[in-house]
């Protein structure tokens, strides 16, 4: 259903959105899988303190998603 609230991004997904342009720009020949692998390595080496802003934003988006989905269901729309 195009009107359904969009799936919420994880903290890691938000991080990937930040750094994917650099990885792809510096390594244009990398496959999608290799780009994802590199981003995973970067995320794993990111300090917990610096993961926090991404986690906070993901939590806020989750909160909004839950409100939106509740409102969407209240309208009588199917899952």
């Amino acid at each position: 259903d195009p009107n359904a609230p969009k799936r919420l991004p994880s903290a890691f997904f938000l991080f990937c959105s930040e750094y994917r342009p650099k990885i792809k720009g510096e390594h244009p020949g990398l496959s999608i899988g290799d780009v994802a692998k590199k981003l995973g390595e970067m995320w794993n080496n990111t300090a917990a303190d610096d993961k926090q802003p991404y986690e906070k934003k993901a939590a806020k988006l989750k909160e909004k998603y839950e409100k939106d989905i509740a409102a969407y269901r209240a309208k009588g729309k199917p899952d």
């Epitope: 930040e18 650099k22 510096e26 080496n45 990111t46 300090a47 917990a48 802003p53 991404y54 934003k57």
Partner: antibody, heavy 120, light 107 residues
Framework: EVQLLESGGGLVQPGGSLRLSCAAS????????MLWVRQAPGKGLEWVSY????????NYADSVKGRFTISRDNSKNTLYLQMNSLRAEDTAVYYC?????????????WGQGTLVTVSS | DIQMTQSPDTLSLSPGERATLSCRAS???????LAWYQQKPGQAPRLLIY???TRATGIPDRFSGSVSGTEFTLTISSLQPDDFATYYC????????FGQGTKLEIK
């Protein structure tokens, strides 16, 4: 060649404000996280603040949280640090630095710094 | 917070000698996120080593880094006049913490 050039430092009274800028050139600015690091006269290095490539994510050292704001304008290749409620202990040379990753994170390029003096 | 303690505070050596600078972390640190910087008076710091042991671009091979547990070591095999400066280690496991620095001076 990567270049980072800070400006905006100067003498300011306690409680005052200042806005530092860091003009970047020689690389794709929007790909990189950027940071501010400071060094009080005769002292060591202290991390101040971090901003992600898009500017959507930031972090601050406890000593400046709530007083300093980091931002960036990727269309102008410029990093900023808005400093409010300045204290004597904020007196330092402020460096902007590029944060990079290659099997680990590190600062690979630094500007020459701009001196901020907080004094009455 | 992780504390980085460098030793000695000051090291007095002559050109041609070997310098060994130590940096100890108060708790476990990911060695991938450990870097060394050189700073000369009135200048910005310069990256020497990242990932505890990888030399940055353009850094001569007389500089090397190693790790043993929570102790990180920067070694300069044969000191050149240009090497006399202050050296900082920096960890990135919990925010960004620098050591207090080791000043390498001419004896």
């Amino acid at each position: 060649e990567v270049q980072l050039l800070e400006s905006g430092g100067g003498l300011v009274q306690p409680g005052g404000s200042l806005r530092l800028s860091c003009a970047a050139s020689g690389f794709t600015f929007s790909w990189y996280s950027m940071l501010w690091v400071r060094q009080a006269p005769g002292k060591g290095l202290e991390w101040v603040s971090y901003i992600s490539p898009s500017g959507g994510f930031t972090n601050y050292a406890d000593s400046v949280k709530g007083r300093f704001t980091i931002s960036r304008d990727n269309s102008k290749n410029t990093l900023y640090l808005q400093m409010n409620s300045l204290r004597a202990e904020d007196t330092a040379v402020y460096y902007c630095a590029r944060w990079d990753y290659n099997s680990g994170w590190y600062y690979d390029h630094w500007g020459q710094g701009t001196l901020v003096t907080v004094s009455s | 917070d992780i504390q980085m303690t460098q030793s000695p505070d000051t090291l007095s050596l002559s050109p041609g000698e070997r310098a060994t600078l130590s940096c100890r972390a108060s708790q476990s640190v990911n060695s991938r996120n450990l870097a060394w910087y050189q700073q000369k008076p009135g200048q910005a710091p310069r990256l020497l080593i990242y990932g505890a042991s990888t030399r940055a671009t353009g850094i001569p091979d007389r500089f090397s880094g190693s790790v043993s547990g929570t102790e990180f070591t920067l070694t300069i095999s044969s000191l050149q006049p240009d090497d006399f400066a202050t050296y900082y280690c920096q960890q990135y496991n919990s925010y960004f913490t620098f050591g207090q620095g080791t000043k390498l001076e001419i004896k």
